[in-house]
Amino acid sequence: EYSNCGENEYYNQTTGLCQECPPCGPGEEPYLSCGYGTKDEDYGCVPCPAEKFSKGGYQICRRHKDCEGFFRATVLTPGDMENDAECGPCLPGYYMLENRPRNIYGMVCYSCLLAPPNTKECVG
């Protein structure tokens, strides 16, 4: 009866049709499962835990970017439940490679110990 329901649809026994799973709001993630025709009885949305964020819909909460620890950059905007953190300039003692394509996380800062001579962030 419901084998053709989509990824985010459950089969509504009252209407005989596939129906959208209730999407979560920003700062929330799905609790239990819904999709491909079935919906857990207690399916719903729960707030993102600390250090995580979600734009809503059906996505799970993701960890904020670790600007200082991973990217060795300053924190421009700390993340909240609805938004990722935004990283700013490199921390002291680190520099950003020029003309380097961003990776999927953004720019990564490198230690001045590895810098070419006269790199401006590393001078002085």
Partner: antibody, heavy 121, light 112 residues
């Protein structure tokens, strides 16, 4: 009297998009799902999908995912279907249809007159 | 998707004749709730389809009693006891036990 009033015929070029409307009257627009059905010339009927005007939730036949976008405007009791990237295969009559689901009776009880779409360069 | 196969595709009749149209589904149309969602629609020339029979054998409001539906599982029949001029057109069977709803190819009831 329950009525579904269609928009006028459409002549569109291949690759273009078209948006058709269906204005409901004589009943509570948000109390029924609105479905869309395609009838190619001289052929059978094909279910496209539906929208629940109460909350805007939609579900499409897998065959029409990416082809048809369904929307509704509660304030004017009007449902819309937009078809994009049109080809000659999309030339057809398009019906809006009210869906009844009371007491486990599930059927299409009121059909609009059908909008003709012709895709031609 | 469920395939609905109608026969015949064309049915020439004289007014007053009995007419019978068959519809077969590729899977059983008995829903887990016990109902069978097999319906019949009539599309008169130049018009939209209209519901005639719902759930195998229930006549929709305003439908004359010369129309009757029967069948179960995968095999269904629509009968018109005495064909009148206003009955001419294309008859479609349809199911919505399974998603997505599907329709037969249609049977054209026409005068001999």
């Amino acid at each position: 009297e329950v009525q579904l009033k269609k928009s006028g015929p459409e002549l569109v070029k291949p690759g273009a998009s078209v948006k058709m409307s269906c204005k409901a009257s004589g009943y509570s627009f948000t109390g029924y799902n609105m479905h869309w059905v395609k009838q190619s010339h001289g052929k059978s009927l094909e279910w496209i999908g539906y929208i629940d005007p109460y909350n805007g939730a939609t579900s499409n036949n897998q065959r029409f995912k990416g082809k048809a976008t369904l929307t509704a405007d509660k304030s004017s009791s009007t449902a819309y279907i937009q078809l994009n990237s049109l080809t000659s295969e999309d030339s057809a009559f398009y019906y809006c249809v009210r869906y009844y689901y009371g007491d486990y009776h599930w059927y299409f009880d009121v059909w609009g007159a059908g909008t003709t779409v012709t895709v031609s360069s | 998707d469920i395939v609905m196969t109608q026969s015949p595709l064309s049915l020439p009749v004289s007014l007053g004749d009995q007419a019978s149209i068959s519809c077969r589904s590729s899977q059983s149309l008995v829903h887990s709730n016990g109902n069978t969602y097999l319906h019949w629609y009539l599309q008169k020339p130049g018009q939209s389809p209209n519901l005639l029979i719902y759930k195998v054998s229930n006549r929709f409001s305003g439908v004359p009693d010369r129309f009757s539906g029967s069948g179960s599982g995968t095999d269904f029949t629509l009968k018109i006891s005495r064909v009148e001029a206003e009955d001419l057109g294309v008859y479609f069977c349809s199911q919505n036990t399974h998603v997505p709803p599907t329709f037969g190819a249609g049977t054209k009831l026409e005068l001999k």
